[in-house]
C-alpha cells in the first residue's frame, strides 16, 4: 500500500494529512515525541507541590518531581505523598508515630512489624525501636564455629492502605 | 535563562558565501527543531529555514532554496546557516528562533553589497 | 503560499487608549498564529500563541482571539512601553509567514 505521507513529519511537529504542505511546528508549550502524530500534546505542567525536573521541549514533555517534605508515587510521578519522620507512617489524618512493636525506618511507607527472633528460636540481641527493628541474637545452633551471629531482618510486607496523595498533571 | 547568539555576519559581495552560526544555550538544544528569519533593513520577517531536532527534515523559502543550506550539531549546541550564491535581497538580519518561535537571538547582519 | 495581512499599517495614539490589531490569512490556518512585537534594534518577543494564549511574562493587558482567517490582538490600555511594531504570523504550514507588521506611535 502507499506509505503514509505523515510519517515523514518528525518529532516537534504535528501531520495534518489533508493538506499539502503537511509537516506544523508544534506551538509554545506543546511537543510531540514521535514522528507522524496527527496532534501535539500540551506539555505537563509542574505546578503547587510538584517541581519541574525537567523542562519541556517541543519534542518530549515536562517531568516533575516533588517539593520538598514530599516524595513521587506512581508512573511519571503523577503523585506527590507528603514525607513523614521516620519512626512515623501516613494515615489519612497525617503522620503517626508507629504503634509499639512497629517500626518504619524511612520517611515514607507505612510502619512494619518488628522480626519475631524466637520464631527462628533467637534472643533479642539489641531491642526495636519506633526508626529501628530487633537485632536478633544467635541461637544455640549458631554458636558452632564459623556461624553468623546476626539475622538480618524479615523483608518488608507490602503497603496495606491506600496513600493520602496529591495529584496533579 | 534560553539565549541564542548569532555570529557571522558582516559584508559580501554578491556571488559571495557566508556561514551563520547560532550558539544555543539554556535549553536542550537537541530536543528543539530550530528556524532561521531575516529581517531586510526597515522591512518586515521573512522565515527563511528550518531544521527538525534530529536534523532529518529540512524546510527552505523558495527564495533560498538550492543556495542555502541549514545544519545543527547537537553537540556543540550549534545551529548554522551556510550562505552561497549570495544577492543584494539576501541583506537583512538574521535570526535563530527554536520551533516554538519563542526565543530570538538578537541576530547578525548581513550585507550584500559591490 | 499562506499571505498574512495587517492593519492598519500605522495607528497613532495616546497612552491609556484601548487598541485593537488585525491579522487577516489567506486561507484557514486554524488557531495556528501567533503576536510578536518589535522594539527598534530589538528581535521580536513572541506575546501571543495559539491565537489567544499570552506566554510566559506577558502582561494582561494583552489578549488575542480569532480562529480560521480573522485575528485581532488587543491592548486594553496602552503603556508607554507598548510603542512599537507588532507582527502576525502563522505556523498552520510552511512555509511560515508573517504579516507586514502595524507601527504604533505615540500621538
Known amino acids: 500500500g502507499l506509505q503514509d505521507p505523515c510519517s515523514n513529519c518528525p518529532a516537534g511537529t504535528f501531520c495534518d494529512n489533508n493538506r499539502n504542505q503537511i509537516c506544523s511546528p508544534c506551538p509554545p508549550n506543546s511537543f510531540s515525541s514521535a514522528g507522524g502524530q496527527r496532534t501535539c500534546d500540551i506539555c505537563r505542567q509542574c505546578k503547587g507541590v510538584f517541581r519541574t525536573r525537567k523542562e519541556c521541549s517541543s519534542t518530549s514533555n515536562a517531568e516533575c518531581d516533588c517539593t520538598p517534605g514530599f516524595h513521587c508515587l506512581g508512573a511519571g510521578c503523577s503523585m506527590c505523598e507528603q514525607d513523614c519522620k521516620q519512626g512515623q507512617e501516613l494515615t489519612k489524618k497525617g503522620c503517626k508515630d508507629c504503634c509499639f512493636g512497629t517500626f518504619n525506618d524511612q520517611k515514607r511507607g507505612i510502619c512494619r512489624p518488628w522480626t519475631n527472633c524466637s520464631l527462628d528460636g533467637k534472643s533479642v540481641l539489641v531491642n526495636g525501636t519506633k526508626e529501628r527493628d530487633v537485632v536478633c541474637g544467635p541461637s544455640p545452633a549458631d554458636l558452632s564455629p564459623g556461624a553468623s551471629s546476626v539475622t538480618p531482618p524479615a523483608p518488608a510486607r507490602e503497603p496495606g492502605h491506600s496513600p493520602q496523595d496529591i495529584e496533579g498533571r | 535563562e534560553v539565549q541564542l547568539v548569532e555570529s557571522g555576519g558582516g559584508l559580501v559581495q554578491p556571488g559571495g558565501s557566508l556561514r551563520l552560526s547560532c550558539a544555543a544555550s539554556g535549553f536542550t538544544f537537541s530536543e528543539f527543531g530550530m528556524h532561521w528569519v531575516r529581517q531586510a533593513p526597515g522591512k518586515g520577517l521573512e522565515w527563511v529555514s528550518y531544521i527538525s531536532s534530529g536534523g532529518s527534515t529540512i524546510y527552505y523559502a523558495d527564495s533560498v532554496k538550492g543556495r542555502f543550506t541549514i545544519s545543527r550539531d547537537n553537540a556543540k549546541n550549534s545551529l548554522y546557516l551556510q550562505m552561497n550564491s549570495l544577492r543584494a535581497e539576501d541583506t537583512a538580519v538574521y535570526y535563530c528562533a527554536r520551533d516554538w518561535v519563542d526565543y530570538w537571538g538578537q541576530g547578525t547582519l548581513v550585507t550584500v553589497s559591490s | 503560499e499562506i499571505v498574512m495581512t495587517q492593519s492598519p499599517a500605522t495607528l497613532s495614539l495616546s497612552p491609556g487608549e484601548r487598541v485593537t490589531l488585525s491579522c487577516k490569512a489567506s486561507e484557514n490556518v486554524g488557531s495556528y498564529v501567533s503576536w510578536y512585537q518589535q522594539k527598534p534594534g530589538q528581535a521580536p518577543r513572541l506575546l501571543i500563541y495559539g491565537a489567544s494564549n499570552r506566554y510566559t511574562g506577558v502582561p494582561a493587558r494583552f489578549s488575542g482571539s480569532g480562529s480560521g482567517t480573522d485575528f485581532t490582538l488587543t491592548i486594553s490600555s496602552v503603556e508607554p512601553e507598548d510603542f512599537a511594531v507588532y507582527y502576525c504570523?502563522?505556523?498552520?504550514?510552511?512555509?511560515?509567514?508573517f504579516g507586514g507588521g502595524t507601527k504604533l506611535e505615540l500621538k
Open positions: 504570523g502563522q505556523s498552520y504550514s510552511y512555509p511560515l509567514t
